[in-house]
Interface confidence: low
């Protein structure tokens, strides 16, 4: 998706709904694309992204991607439609209110990704094992 803060606003009298017809407004996410990061060996990190954007589409969720290779560490923050893969991975945890990082297999780098569906939830990315996504207290009940 393109950063929504550069888009023209659309004025109409309709609220977009999800597949079940539930009322949804576009979400707020940190949206700094790819930036260098100092986040390393921590239980959780803040994104240090100063741009909060209204996602382009109501169904989009917040995504954060943490990558480490021999040269640097980057953190990517975006909005993305969970029905579509991102970096070739499905957003399995899109319904979570917290951004719980999960490692993905990528050759030549360490690659973690998380997605979540509460406003600005990709501002705080969580690596700690104590945050287990099977814990119902961390799950936002969404019926897609």
């Amino acid at each position: 998706t393109i950063p929504p803060h550069v888009q023209k606003s659309v004025n109409n009298d309709m609220i977009v709904t999800d597949n079940n017809g539930a009322v949804k407004f576009p979400q707020l996410c940190k949206f700094c694309d790819v930036r260098f990061s100092t986040c390393d060996n921590q239980k959780s990190c803040m994104s240090n992204c100063s741009i909060t954007s209204i996602c382009e589409k109501p169904q989009e969720v917040c995504v954060a991607v943490w990558r480490k290779n021999d040269e640097n560490i980057t953190l990517e923050t975006v909005c993305h439609d969970p029905k579509l893969p991102y970096h070739d991975f499905i957003l399995e945890d899109a319904a979570s209110p917290k951004c719980i990082m999960k490692e993905k297999k990528k050759p030549g780098e360490t690659f973690f990704m998380c997605s979540c569906s509460s406003d600005e939830c990709n501002d705080n990315i969580i690596f700690s094992e104590e945050y287990n996504t099977s814990n119902p207290d961390l799950l936002l009940v969404i019926f897609q």
């Epitope: 606003s9 309709m14 017809g21 707020l28």
Partner: antibody
Framework: QVQLVESGGGLVQPGGSLRLSCAVS????????MSWVRQAPGKGLEWVSA????????HNTDSVKGRFSISRDNSKNTLYLQMNSLRAEDTAVYFC??????????????WGQGTLVTVSS | DIQMTQSPSSLSASVGDRVTITCRAS??????LNWYQQKPGKAPKLLIY???SLQSGVPSRFSGSGSGTDFTLTISSLQPEDFATYYC?????????FGQGTKVEIK
Amino acid sequence: QVQLVESGGGLVQPGGSLRLSCAVSGFTFRRYAMSWVRQAPGKGLEWVSAISASGDRTHNTDSVKGRFSISRDNSKNTLYLQMNSLRAEDTAVYFCAKGLAASGKNFFDPWGQGTLVTVSS
Amino acid sequence: DIQMTQSPSSLSASVGDRVTITCRASQSISSYLNWYQQKPGKAPKLLIYAASSLQSGVPSRFSGSGSGTDFTLTISSLQPEDFATYYCQQSYSTPPTFGQGTKVEIK
């Protein structure tokens, strides 16, 4: 603590206009969708209008379309409801509420204390 | 519009009683169902959202269940501060609609 304080209610003649305000404090107003919900005397609750966090999307219940307009000023942490062509059946306590928001949490919470609008000649 | 019907419209109960209020939607609303409590002259207060999720700060004696068209709010042991009117609300489709309310009175 979170506070929503409505003002602007009062007695108005049929066909008249009123502008309600809801001053918000205790949470980051610009991040959240907001709604107006009304309650006629001795009756139940009726959702009236909603506006997205940025203010670029609005939605009204059919009975007020073309007469009521919801807006917000994120720099002032204030929600508004402009009510024109008022009718006797618009008489109610009008509540502002945080909600009708993204992420599946489609509920109203918290609410203001309400402001009474009476339409009568 | 989706119609929400609560029953009973009022009930009398004593402190310590188990109280059950039902809400029926005119069509399936999945689990997009919220419950509110309102006391006279006050604003409504959210109790339960998404049919069964307890809102932060709400006592655990309140619980919600159901999906589709039939929903239940249960107060396991009625307390003096629970005497109020309770409303269900669907957020499955616009406009969001409320039930007519159930008034819980002291027996």
